[in-house]
């Protein structure tokens, strides 16, 4: 999603289908206040950012508010009244969920069913990943309710668990974001532990969306 | 140290918006897990969940109330505000905001003081 | 919504006595329950979360047990501070409810 018009690079990110955030990074420009102009419609007059973001003082992206738009944001970063970036984006092609909450565990014998509060829009997979000390690396399931039941488990073992949300990459194609990751939890026995003991340094969980 | 203290109008006429504000100090909710929730009791009763905002503006709503109540934050001035629009005599209670940290399975672990509201005409 | 009774609304005791505080679940809750200590200033307290981890801060004297719908507080070695009402809350699903609290009281 960069494109380098004078070396301008830009990141777009619409956080819940909430709140769209596009960040420039202009080395050209660095110690200059680029503005940023939009609409979400290519027959209205651009608007100004109300809401910018700053790093060392300048001018670094804007935030606007978006709420369950499937629109085309039209956007221009200049320097002044000179266009040094112009563009335009679906935005739901960024789409990052927001990372679950609530999340509870059933247990019954050797299975645990996850849940989580669903977020208001489709088209999304729930990920669930979990690890005991004793695996390599963690183990994964998801569905596209937050409803995923994982069976198999030994009773016996601590497993830790946490949760995100990736949007389907045959609806808003592969340039989306998941989710940050629920809290980790630990359980046992369908107990809840601070920690699973013994357990080794974790390895980096797969992050491939 | 970890506080949390409400504001609000005291007294206000039915049908008016109440506007209710937790100022918070001892911890920051741009924190990830972090969660600020409204809690209300009229006199004599029990207590009421009424909304929840979280470190990611994410916001739960009680469905009973939700067409009433909007919750909002000023995470760089450490607040957390509630608006009850249309109010009657059935919101008059003691409105108490308070936190949910990381790893308290959505416990509330400090709550302020209160603030009482009285809706008379 | 989730139910949350606390059949008893009022309980005296001794200074001294252990005191048990019960609350029913309208359906099973997997153990996400909270106990709130609320005194008569109207100052509320956490004291244990999911059904029997106590908050930290809190007296060892405090304890919760249960499972499914039936959960309870217990108070050993009841002192003079914990005269208060005590709340039971779910927090299985949303919305999150209340009992509608326990009063203690001395005899």
């Known amino acids: 999603q960069g494109g380098a018009a004078e070396g301008v690079q830009i990141q777009i990110i619409y956080f819940n289908l909430e709140t769209v955030q596009v960040t420039w990074n202009a080395s050209k420009y660095s110690r200059t206040n680029l503005t940023f102009h939009y609409r979400f419609n290519g027959d209205e007059a651009y608007d100004q950012c109300t809401n910018y973001l700053l790093q060392e003082g300048h001018t670094s992206g804007c935030l606007l508010d978006a709420e369950q738009r499937d629109d085309i944001l039209y956007f221009s970063i200049r320097n002044g009244t000179h266009p040094v970036f112009t563009a335009s984006r679906w935005m739901v092609y960024y789409l990052k969920p927001s990372s679950p909450k609530h999340v509870r565990f059933s247990w019954h014998q050797d299975a645990v069913t996850v849940t989580c509060s669903d977020l208001s829009y489709g088209d999304l997979l729930y990920e669930v990943q979990y690890r005991s000390p004793f695996d390599t690396e963690w183990q994964s399931k998801q569905e596209n309710t937050c409803n995923v039941t994982i069976e198999g488990l030994d009773a016996e073992k601590c497993y830790s668990f946490w949760v995100r949300v990736k949007a389907m990459e045959d609806v808003y194609g592969p340039d989306t974001y998941p989710s940050d990751w629920s809290e980790v939890t630990c359980w046992q026995r369908g107990e809840i532990r601070d920690a699973c003991a013994e357990t080794p340094t974790p390895p980096k969980p797969k992050l491939s969306k | 140290q970890v506080t949390l203290k409400e504001s609000g109008p005291g007294i206000l006429k039915p049908s008016q918006t109440l506007s209710l504000t937790c100022s918070f100090s001892?911890?920051?909710?741009?924190?990830?897990?972090?969660?600020v929730g409204w809690i209300r009791q009229p006199s004599g009763k029990g207590l009421e969940w009424l909304a929840h905002?979280?470190?990611?503006?994410?916001?739960y709503y009680n469905p009973s109330l939700k067409s009433q109540l909007t919750i909002s934050k000023d995470t760089s001035r450490n607040q957390v505000f509630l608006k009850i629009t249309s109010v009657d005599t059935a919101d008059t209670a003691t409105y108490y905001c308070?936190?949910?940290?990381?790893?308290?399975?959505?416990?509330?672990?400090?709550w302020g003081q209160g603030t009482s509201v009285t809706v008379s005409s | 919504d989730i139910v949350m009774t606390q059949a008893a609304s009022s309980l005296s005791a001794s200074l001294g006595d252990r005191v048990t505080i019960s609350c029913r679940a309208s359906?099973?809750?997997?153990?996400?329950l909270n106990w709130y200590q609320q005194k008569p200033d109207g100052t509320v307290k956490l004291l244990i979360y999911?059904?029997?981890r106590l908050h930290s801060g809190v007296p060892s004297r405090f304890s919760g047990s249960g499972s499914g719908t039936d959960y309870s507080l217990t108070i050993r070695n009841l002192e003079q501070e914990d005269i208060a009402t005590y709340f039971c809350?779910?927090?299985?699903?949303?919305?999150?409810?209340f009992g509608g609290g326990t009063k203690l009281e001395i005899k």
């Open positions: 308070s936190r949910r940290p990381r790893g308290t399975m959505d416990a509330m672990d400090y």
């Open positions: 001892g911890f920051s909710l741009s924190t990830s897990g972090m969660g």
């Open positions: 905002i979280w470190w990611d503006d994410d916001k």
């Open positions: 359906q099973d809750i997997s153990k996400y």
């Open positions: 999911y059904t029997s």
């Open positions: 809350q779910q927090v299985y699903t949303l919305p999150w409810t």
